[in-house]
Amino acid sequence: DVERTTCPPEKEVHEIDESLIFYKKRELEACVDAALLAAQMDRVDAIPFTYEQLDVLKHKLDELYPQGYPESVIRHLGHLFLKMSPEDIRKWNVTSLETLKALLKVSKGHEMSAQVATLIDRVVVGRGQLDKDTVDTLTAFCPGCLCSLSPERLSSVPPSVIGAVRPQDLDTCGPRQLDVLYPKARLAFQNMSGSEYFVKIRPFLGGAPTEDVKALSQQNVSMDLATFMKLRREAVLPLTVAEVQKLLGPHVEGLKVEEQHSPVRDWILKQRQDDLDTLGLGLQGGIPNGYLILDLSVREALS
């Protein structure tokens, strides 16, 4: 912490300007009035403060706003945002997309994924839902950031907004997030024709249930392997060899090079070796011919 001293009269600060870069840490602490700093935050980013000096300025704002900064200050944080922790950001109430854009720009190229995720969360809370303007801002200024939101936050996305989401925005989404987004996407694209529907729904398929995957296998969609491997394991395991062949079309030969990865590996183990042989890939590990498959879960349910 910065030690308290009194400000020498000749060092008194009446406005935030470039002269402050020559102030030592303790002089900044003693001479800069927190209210003045807050009122003139828009000037701070134009001044080449050192990281140590920025620490002092942050400390002053923290003292002035212990419950969290007002948006008028947040909007003009500039490089001071780099000093914020997720705990700091959690106290904020942000509703303006201009604020979001400004801070996303500042964070680019810095390791700030936790801070950015918290900021986006605060924006969604502040605006009440993940509306189209927010999604557009995220896709433009922070590709992939959509996936930093929790499934609970994503549940506030109206289906009408799903069309604004691009495939690359979903690259880092996990299964729980796709579970939330997939039904919305299905609803949003339901009036599209077969091939157009598949192109649109493809990035969301990691949240699709088995019955929807089986339905796709009847539609000549030629699903690529990367999409197939993002499907839920539970959605893939019940598929037959014939269904997977129909689903993947020409991409089915790629099963050979990905046979060690889930869900491909787990699926192979559940297929009859005879059926796997029809794929012409030399896949091994299926159930040998002549073996009976006992589903013990059914027997337990009956007893």
């Epitope: 690529d224 491997m229 079309g249 089915v252 790629g254 090079v257 990905e258 042989d277 012409g280 890939l281």
Partner: antibody
Framework: QVQLQQPGTELVKPGASVKLSCKAS????????MHWVKQRPGQGLEWIGN????????YYNERFMSKAKMTVDKSSSTAYMQLSSLTSEDSAVYYC??????????WGPGTLVTVSA | DIVMTQSPSSLAMSVGQKVTMSCKSS????????????LAWYQQKPGQSPTLLVY???TRESGVPDRFIGGGSGTDFTLTISSVQAEDLADYFC?????????FGGGTNLEIK
């Protein structure tokens, strides 16, 4: 070792058809898919399609859907591609290539098809 | 279709020099589950058929000299020849096998000075 044999040249008349062959040896024919690729003189490579020699299922680049038909004869370990309604645009070298999983691990020497009256 | 763009279209190098050529795809070729990039590099010497050099963007095919090094991920890929030899005179093609129709780049022609 893996070998793919293709005839060197085929001279055909405009409007006619030609059936190109690719005889495989040195590996289990039904364990690897076969691809066909077109290369026009001094130009790049174009993927025509792939075929599963085990089942005969074939898949095409849409651009070649009405131009090419791929088949296999398991008994002779040979892949075929028939090209129909030939024009000067079809004059090119046609390669068969054995898959390595997705990439093309072994290529035949290619057949030069010349369409000329 | 996925568009593959190679650069430069040609280059001339002296024996022993290091050469790097680029291949860019119009969309990602990364399988985020297996972390494999579905990109291959081929060499085509004058009057011959292409041969596989590299698959999965960076895995060298067996028998390929270790001066051939594939790199990159997502949409940007490179093939580097660490010390060019006279026998490397050829066209070099990249190909995506992420989604059909599998597409090739226009090629880079390597001349030896």
């Amino acid at each position: 070792q893996v070998q793919l044999q293709q005839p060197g040249t085929e001279l055909v008349k405009p409007g006619a058809s030609v059936k190109l062959s690719c005889k495989a040896s040195g590996y289990t024919f039904t364990n690897y898919w076969m691809h066909w690729v077109k290369q026009r003189p001094g130009q790049g490579l174009e993927w025509i399609g792939n075929i599963n020699p085990s089942s005969g299922d074939s898949y095409y680049n849409e651009r070649f859907m009405s131009k090419a038909k791929m088949t296999v004869d398991k008994s002779s370990s040979t892949a075929y591609m028939q090209l129909s309604s030939l024009t000067s645009e079809d004059s090119a070298v046609y390669y068969c290539a054995r898959s390595g999983g997705l990439w093309l691990a072994f290529w035949g020497p290619g057949t030069l098809v010349t369409v000329s009256a | 279709d996925i568009v593959m763009t190679q650069s430069p279209s040609s280059l001339a190098m002296s024996v022993g020099q290091k050469v790097t050529m680029s291949c860019k795809s119009s969309q990602t070729l990364l399988n985020s589950v297996s972390q494999n990039n579905y990109l291959a590099w081929y060499q085509q010497k004058p009057g011959q058929s292409p041969t596989l050099l590299v698959y999965f963007a960076s895995t060298r095919e067996s028998g390929v000299p270790d001066r051939f090094i594939g790199g990159g991920s997502g949409t940007d890929f490179t093939l580097t020849i660490s010390s060019v030899q006279a026998e490397d005179l050829a066209d070099y093609f990249c190909q995506q096998h992420y989604r059909t129709p599998y597409t090739f780049g226009g090629g880079t022609n390597l001349e030896i000075k």
